[in-house]
Interface confidence: low
C-alpha cells in the first residue's frame, strides 16, 4: 500500500514539532508532541525513550517497563504506587518518569 | 468495564462560557486519545476535536475557536467559549482505538451516553 | 475538508432483505473508515472498523467493504432489532495539519 505525503503506516509513531518560530534563528521555539498511528489494541507509549505504539494491556495493568521504555543498556524500575517509571544508567543517573 | 461518562450539561443563556467533562472507570484517560462529538436534537453526529496524551489538539474546521478541549489526570474536558442556540445539543466524549491515523483503523470504540446542553434565552 | 457522502438517507426494508448503505469520501481514506448504529436516546455503538473488520460482539449479519474512496456497509439478512440510524465516519491524519474526522450524514433504516 502506497503512502502520501505526511501519511503515518499502522503501528508506527512520528514526532511533530509545533510553534516553530524561524524569524528567530537563534531563539528557535519548537514544541515537540507525537503522533502514532496505532493499531486495534496497541496505544501510545515509550519505547527506548522514543513514541511507540504499545500494548493497551501493559497500560491498564501499569507494568510500564514492560513497554522497554529506557535506552537500550538501562535498567528500568518500577515507581512505587506503579506512578511511573525510572531509567538507570551504567553510570547510576537515574531520569524518572511519572505518568499523570 | 470500560466505561465512559459525560457531565455538565445544562440549560445556558447565550454567550455563557460552558465546561463538560467526561470520566472514565475501567480504564486510563491518559494513554488514550479521546474525542468529543456531538448531535443536535433529531440530527446528525459531528465531530467536534480530539486530544493527544500529550495535551496537544485537533479541531473540526468548524469548532476552531468555538471549543476548547483540554485534560487533566481524570477527565477529558470540553469548554463552549462563547455559546449560541446552535451549540444545543447532546454531547458525547468516546475514546479513540489505538489512534486515528491516516486511513488506518479510525474508530471509536467506547462512547459515554452523552450530556444535554440547551442554550436559551 | 474532507466529506462523508452517505446514501440514501432513509430505506425501508422487510425481515430477512439485504441492505446496503454507501459512503463517498471526498479523496481516498485508505480503509479509514467506520460504520456505527445508532438508537433513539442512546450513543452511537460500533459496527465495523478499518472499512471491513466486524467489532467484537457484531452479529456476523453486518459487513463492510470497499476501497479508495468508496465504502458499503451490508446488513446480510436484516432482522427487526437493525432500525436504527447508521453512520459512516471517516478519517484523515497528516502530519502538517492533524486529524480531521468526518461523519456521514446517517441513514435511517426502518424495518417494515
Known amino acids: 500500500q502506497f503512502l502520501k505525503e505526511g501519511q503515518l503506516a499502522a503501528g508506527t509513531c512520528e514526532i511533530v514539532t509545533l510553534d516553530r518560530d524561524s524569524s528567530q534563528p537563534r531563539r528557535t521555539i519548537a514544541r515537540q508532541t507525537a503522533r502514532c498511528a496505532c493499531r486495534k489494541g496497541q496505544i501510545a507509549g515509550t519505547t527506548r525513550n522514543k513514541p511507540s505504539c504499545v500494548d493497551a494491556r501493559i497500560i491498564k495493568t501499569k507494568q510500564w517497563c514492560d513497554m522497554l521504555p529506557c535506552l537500550e543498556g538501562e535498567g528500568c524500575d518500577l515507581l512505587i504506587n506503579r506512578s511511573g517509571w525510572t531509567c538507570t544508567q551504567p553510570g547510576g543517573r537515574i531520569k524518572t518518569t511519572t505518568v499523570s | 468495564q470500560e466505561q465512559l461518562v459525560e457531565s455538565g450539561g445544562r440549560l445556558v443563556t447565550p454567550g455563557t462560557p460552558l465546561t463538560l467533562s467526561c470520566t472514565a472507570s475501567?480504564?486510563?484517560?491518559?494513554?488514550?486519545?479521546m474525542s468529543w462529538v456531538r448531535q443536535a436534537p433529531g440530527k446528525g453526529l459531528e465531530w467536534i476535536g480530539i486530544i493527544y496524551p500529550s495535551g496537544s489538539t485537533d479541531y473540526a474546521s468548524w469548532a476552531k475557536g468555538r471549543f476548547t478541549i483540554s485534560k487533566t489526570s481524570t477527565t477529558v474536558d470540553l469548554k463552549i467559549t462563547t455559546p449560541t442556540t446552535e451549540d444545543t445539543a447532546t454531547y458525547f466524549c468516546?475514546?479513540?482505538?489505538?489512534?486515528?491515523?491516516?486511513?488506518?483503523?479510525?474508530?471509536?470504540?467506547?462512547w459515554g451516553p452523552g450530556t444535554l446542553v440547551t442554550v436559551s434565552l | 475538508e474532507l466529506v462523508m457522502t452517505q446514501t440514501p438517507p432513509s430505506l425501508s426494508a422487510s425481515v430477512g432483505e439485504t441492505v446496503r448503505i454507501r459512503c463517498l469520501a471526498s479523496e481516498d481514506i485508505y480503509s479509514g473508515i467506520s460504520w456505527y448504529q445508532q438508537k433513539p436516546g442512546k450513543p452511537p455503538t460500533l459496527l465495523i472498523y478499518?472499512?471491513?473488520n466486524l467489532e467484537s460482539g457484531v452479529p456476523p449479519r453486518f459487513s463492510g467493504s470497499g476501497s479508495g474512496s468508496d465504502y458499503t456497509l451490508t446488513i446480510g439478512g436484516v432482522q427487526a432489532e437493525d432500525a436504527a440510524t447508521y453512520y459512516c465516519l471517516g478519517g484523515v491524519t497528516y502530519s502538517s495539519t492533524g486529524t480531521h474526522l468526518t461523519f456521514g450524514a446517517g441513514t435511517n433504516v426502518e424495518i417494515k
Open positions: 475501567g480504564f486510563f484517560l491518559s494513554g488514550y486519545y
Open positions: 468516546a475514546r479513540v482505538a489505538g489512534y486515528v491515523g491516516y486511513g488506518y483503523e479510525t474508530f471509536f470504540d467506547i
Open positions: 478499518g472499512a471491513s
